[in-house]
């Protein structure tokens, strides 16, 4: 049984030309993560692997950094990365675990940060 | 090209054991989960074990548990499914697959290797 | 554990025609469906990941759809080739789960 829920930065703002940090948290659940991957829509940006540490798909090298932890940094922000970002955590025993991310990419220097919210 | 050839299946006895083989190629192996599925002689398919690529984390279906150990030698690029104390439930062709790098999906399977489990 | 349930067990087409094959999860599996395709003798073939991605080397003609409990997989217009059995697969929650297949033979 799957007991576990993801807590994300949800809804969240930056400046074009800057960075942001995308995080997600699996909670409530004793199960082990084997991998984290992170994708803009169907594209699949970088993979946390347990064993093998960090890959980032090379159309992507330039411009997104592993880290924080188990979270990715985008860099060098266009209007064109504005949308939804997921995180989706294999583990054992549980299964496959999806959070989602908005990221408004702004023109502006007002960036507000959105609050936090859980998904089940 | 990528290559998964299976071997060590065969006629055993209730209660016997086995071990099978997945020799892979054309690919870096040390960076990918493995996995055996079998596919029972009414054609349903069964993932049965599956192996991360450093060998750090395994999966075994409940009713294999304790008797079936998956396990693999990235120095060899070898697949392994030492299988004991098997059931005439177990009679099935073994499948070593591979999973793509983001772990959704199985992209490519050996031929099969059979096992019958006799009485 | 989750049970797929494919429909139909088995259907009969005429090559060009469009066939529809459906697979029903037993509960909630977001996204996580995989299809393969098995020839007779032949080790089953990847298709479709993430109900909807083409695996690579896929023919276009084939396509999926659906989230939630309710999958397809569809095949626009049917070719020699294609005449074969097909499972689902989820990938939510272990043990990941097969469906019990659907034989597409020739009308």
């Known amino acids: 049984m799957m007991t576990g829920t993801i807590e994300t930065t949800g809804n969240i703002s930056a400046e074009k030309g800057g960075s942001i940090i995308l995080q997600c948290h699996l909670s409530s659940t004793t199960a082990q993560v084997t991998q984290v991957n992170w994708e803009q829509q169907d594209q699949l940006l970088a993979i946390c692997n347990a064993d093998l540490g960090w890959h980032i798909s090379p159309s992507f090298k330039d411009r997104v950094a592993p880290g924080p932890g188990l979270g990715l940094t985008l860099q060098s922000l266009t209007v064109n990365d504005t949308g939804e970002y997921f995180c989706i955590y294999h583990t054992y025993p549980d299964g496959t675990y999806t959070g989602r991310i908005f990221l408004e990419v702004l023109e502006s220097s007002v960036a507000e940060h959105g609050a936090r919210f859980q998904i089940p | 090209d990528v290559k998964l050839v299976e071997s060590g299946g065969g006629l055993v006895k209730l209660g016997g054991s086995l071990k099978l083989s997945c020799a892979a190629s054309?690919?870096?192996?040390?960076?990918?989960?493995m996995s055996w599925v079998r596919q029972t002689p009414e054609k349903r398919l069964e993932l049965v074990a599956a192996?991360?690529?450093?060998?750090?984390?395994?999966y075994y279906l409940d009713t294999v548990k304790g008797r079936f150990t998956i396990s693999r030698d990235n120095a060899k690029n070898t697949l392994y499914l030492q299988m004991s104390s098997l059931k005439s439930e177990d009679t099935a062709l073994f499948y070593c697959?591979?999973?793509?790098?983001?772990?959704?999906?199985?992209?490519?399977w050996g031929q099969g290797t059979s096992v019958t489990v006799s009485s | 554990a989750i049970q797929m349930t494919q429909s139909p067990s088995s259907l009969s087409a005429s090559v060009g025609d469009r066939v529809t094959i459906t697979c029903q999860a037993s509960?909630?599996?977001?996204?996580?469906l995989s299809w393969y395709q098995q020839k007779p003798g032949k080790a089953p073939k990847l298709l479709i990941y993430?109900?909807?991605t083409l695996a690579s080397g896929v023919p276009s003609r084939f396509s999926g759809s659906g989230s939630g409990t309710d999958f397809t997989l569809t095949i626009s217009s049917l070719q020699p080739d294609d005449f074969a059995t097909y499972y689902c697969?989820?990938?939510?929650?272990?043990?990941?789960?097969f469906g019990g297949g659907t034989k597409v033979e020739i009308k």
């Open positions: 697969q989820q990938g939510q929650t272990y043990p990941f789960t």
């Open positions: 697959t591979r999973w793509l790098l983001s772990l959704y999906a199985m992209d490519y």
């Open positions: 054309g690919f870096t192996f040390s960076s990918y989960t």
């Open positions: 509960q909630n599996i977001n996204v996580w």
């Open positions: 993430k109900a909807s």
């Open positions: 192996i991360s690529s450093g060998g750090s984390y395994t």
